[in-house]
């Protein structure tokens, strides 16, 4: 494939990222889903300075992230490790509440109405953000 | 590598107390709920008592409930068992376990409550 | 409470056998089930998690499937280090409950 070099219609760009702001909501597997068959991944933040971007751009809504921990430990779609990177939790969280009655624990991470960070349950209808990276290949085949 | 290391079993008489510690490693502890989990001798897997990544929630079994205090320090990357009053049939090995789904282990400590 | 139940109770094989445990909740749980092998004198290990969540450094012949109320853990060949003790645990809600296991020896 070819590499992308701007993003592509309906999408921001930002510090060689392309990012894609959603105005329904869905739950986080079915968000994950549309951002991958997008090319893409729910969006990653590994800075404050993304942290802010995003924040600006979903205003105080709750939107899903690519943050979850279905599997045990906290990981980012993406394979950024959680351990050593950015986090920006509210406080008291992540809090796996088990009070909610719907089953489980709460596995998945989206931005609060602050812009921190909350784990819920991941059948919740949130909306959601998909980020892709400029310098990556695309699936696409090249124009030639 | 996430590490969990239990510690503070021993021999105690019925009615006694001991507090139990599990010092964790390798991992963000915050992020993470941790639990205490048994296995009397000879006998299966007993879930203990569960307490949330920042302390604010707290569960208990039946069969421990107003005689054992689970806690944290996150600070200090560790979570604790305190247990008082206790019986002939709280004799067993204390795991403790990180999340819900119990995903990494500690070795054990045996505690031994007999007369 | 969950009550699990767990079949068979023992179960004797040879290396190389494909074998099957079953893990039946009492109520629905959805996927919130694990899988744990035990080894005499030592800690538990997670196998699997959310029912078919191969855990990180789990060899890929351990399988887990079911949803609901009904779960099996499959080990497609036995191998000398896999003969255990097998337990399902339920954390779809408080207070988490394990199965009694099933234990694999050799026949």
């Known amino acids: 494939g070819s590499e992308r070099t701007c993003c592509p219609v309906n999408w921001v760009e930002h510090e060689r990222s392309c990012y894609w702001f959603s105005r329904s909501g869905k739950a986080w597997a079915d968000a994950d889903n549309y951002c991958r068959l997008e090319d893409a991944h729910l969006v990653v933040v590994t800075s404050w300075e993304e942290q802010k971007f995003v924040q600006h751009h979903i205003g105080p809504v709750n939107t899903w992230m690519g943050l979850h921990d279905q599997n045990g430990p906290w990981k980012w779609v993406d394979g950024t490790d959680y351990e050593t990177g950015f986090k920006n939790w509210r406080p008291e969280q992540p809090d796996d509440w088990y009070g909610h009655g719907l089953g489980g624990g709460e596995d998945c991470a989206h931005f609060t109405d602050d812009g921190r960070w909350n784990d819920d349950v991941c059948q919740r209808p949130y909306r959601w953000v998909c980020e892709t990276e400029l310098d990556k290949a695309s699936q696409e085949p090249p124009l030639l | 590598e996430v590490q969990l290391v239990e510690s503070g079993g021993g021999l105690v008489k019925p009615g006694g107390s001991l507090r139990l510690s599990c010092a964790a490693s390798g991992f963000t502890f915050s992020s993470y709920s941790m639990n205490w989990v048994r296995q009397a001798p000879g006998k299966g897997l007993e879930w203990v008592s569960s307490i949330s990544g920042t302390g604010s929630f707290i569960y208990y079994a039946d069969s421990v409930k107003g005689r054992f205090t689970i806690s944290r320090d996150n600070a200090k990357k560790s979570v604790y068992l305190q247990m008082n009053s206790l019986r002939a049939e709280d004799t067993a090995v204390y795991y403790c376990?990180?999340?819900?789904?119990?995903?990494?282990w500690g070795q054990g400590t045996l505690v031994t409550v007999s007369s | 409470d969950i009550q699990m139940t767990q079949s068979p109770s023992s179960l004797s094989a040879s290396v190389g056998d494909r074998v099957t445990i079953t893990c039946r909740a009492s109520q629905a749980i959805s996927n919130y089930l694990a899988w744990f092998q035990q080894k005499p004198g030592k800690a538990p290990k997670s196998l699997i998690y959310g029912a078919s969540g191969l855990q990180s450094g789990v060899p890929s012949k351990f399988s887990g499937s079911g949803s609901g109320t009904d779960f099996t853990l499959t080990i497609s060949s036995l191998q000398p280090e896999d003969f255990a003790t097998y337990y399902c645990q339920q954390y779809n809600s408080y207070p988490f409950t394990f199965g009694p296991g099933t234990k694999v020896d050799f026949k």
């Open positions: 376990a990180r999340v819900s789904g119990f995903d990494y």
